[in-house]
């Protein structure tokens, strides 16, 4: 079952999923002056059996302004900086979630890919948030959001992170300083 | 299910304290912040700070700042709101609701009544 | 704080009406915006929130709309138990700011 909606927005964070559930949807999109070449796949497709989940089909980019010439699917890194879905400012791994079975890793990049990613989620997917550069986080908790049904409709869970910058800081001086830092992550729900 | 339950209404004179609770179950309480809202009698919500209550960290809107005092125990997953003194200003009516950014679950609200 | 003015303050209708509620943020909040229905002697109740996700019990007939500085939440077909007071909440800067309602009442 595919997610209705987007993960949620929080002020000042991103998200980032560390490995995507089978099901997943991967649009083949293309920076601008190229297109997807003419028979090619509308999406990557996050598919497996009980051992082993890889992306199905291939993206593929071509100049607009060429008819023939085909990209093929290769690594770029320095591509993948430039992707604000892909990339990660911190080290925050809490789980090797491409190591859980039914799901895929990041795929690689392909040539003259579009600099963001739009990604098509399924219920049970997990996205991990952080602060974005000049905020913190204001404690040591979990912070991400799973994709849940709920009374027949899917909706992502509220993520706990709230970032803070230093000017914020300074006006709240209620604040007081973690005293643990307690790991694990918000239990899943029974609804209705 | 999720539940938020609050301990019973108050009447109290002006100057003595008062410490109001709100009870979590049904989730993981320690992963969640809370939120304490006031409403006066005929007016709107009035959003007062919140917990994290795995760690205590506490924020407060600046209008509350030193006027009440946020506090948990997660041992027993219950989230506190606190007077030292309390005035006729306080005659109120206090939620405790789950966030951070928007509030899904509520506590049925405590009437807070201080009056000589 | 950023501050929140929903207008009007009371609407008068009728059952089958179509009513729509206007909020207003002094500064630009995205889209962090979350609307609440309140009846009397109750707690508040989430409607919706990102400015236009419904919460999964809410009725169809409540959608929000809006970004930046000003935000509709409207009923496209008022029902008996819609009557009540509706509030507009922020939650783009601390601290989280709330309007000071609109009333929706039996014309």
């Known amino acids: 079952e595919l997610c209705d909606d987007d993960p949620p927005e929080i002020p000042h964070a991103t998200f980032k999923a560390m490995a995507y559930k089978e099901g997943t949807m991967l649009n083949c999109e293309c920076k601008r002056g190229f297109r997807r070449i003419k028979s090619g796949s509308l999406y990557m497709l996050c598919t497996g059996n009980s051992s082993h989940s890889s992306w199905d089909n291939q993206c593929q980019c071509t100049s607009s302004a060429t008819r023939n010439t085909t990209k093929q699917v290769t690594p770029q890194p320095e591509e993948q900086k430039e992707r604000k879905t892909t990339e990660m400012q911190s080290p925050m791994q809490p789980v090797d979630q491409a190591s859980l079975p039914g799901h895929c890793r990041e795929p690689p990049p392909w040539e003259n890919e579009a600099t963001e990613r739009i990604y098509h989620f399924v219920v049970g997917q997990m996205v991990y948030y952080q602060c974005v550069q000049g905020y913190r986080a204001l404690h040591r908790g979990p912070a991400e959001s799973v994709c849940k049904m709920t009374h027949g409709k899917t909706r992502w869970t509220q993520p706990q992170l709230i970032c803070t910058g230093e000017m914020e800081t300074s006006q709240f001086p209620g604040e007081e300083k973690p005293q643990a830092s307690p790991e694990g992550r918000p239990e899943s729900e029974t609804s209705c | 299910e999720v539940q938020l339950v609050q301990s019973g209404a108050e009447v109290k004179k002006p100057g003595e304290s008062l410490k109001i609770s709100c009870k979590g179950s049904?989730?993981?309480?320690?992963?969640?912040?809370i939120a304490w809202v006031r409403q006066m009698p005929g007016k709107g919500l009035e959003w007062m700070g919140i917990?994290?209550?795995?760690?205590?960290?506490?924020r407060y809107s600046p209008s509350f700042q030193g006027q009440v005092t946020i506090s948990a125990d997660k041992s027993i997953n219950t989230a506190y709101l606190q007077w030292s003194s309390l005035r006729a200003s306080d005659t109120a009516m206090y939620y405790c609701?789950?966030?951070?950014?928007?509030?899904?679950?509520w506590g049925q609200g405590t009437l807070v009544t201080v009056s000589s | 704080d950023i501050v929140m003015t929903q207008s009007p303050s009371t609407l008068s209708a009728s059952v089958g009406d179509r009513v729509t509620i206007t909020c207003r943020a002094s500064?630009?909040?995205?889209?962090?915006l979350a609307w609440y229905q309140q009846k009397p002697g109750r707690a508040p109740e989430l409607l919706i929130y990102?400015?236009?996700t419904l919460e999964s019990r809410v009725p169809s007939r409540f959608s929000g709309s809006g970004s930046g500085t000003e935000f509709t939440l409207t009923i496209s077909s008022l029902q008996p138990e819609d009557f009540a007071t509706y509030y507009c909440?922020?939650?783009?800067?601390?601290?989280?700011?709330v309007g000071q309602g609109t009333k929706v009442e039996i014309k």
């Open positions: 609701a789950r966030g951070p950014y928007y509030f899904e679950y």
């Open positions: 049904g989730y993981s309480f320690t992963n969640y912040w």
């Open positions: 917990i994290y209550p795995g760690d205590s960290v506490t």
């Open positions: 500064q630009s909040i995205s889209s962090f």
């Open positions: 990102k400015a236009s």
């Open positions: 909440q922020q939650y783009k800067s601390f601290s989280w700011t």
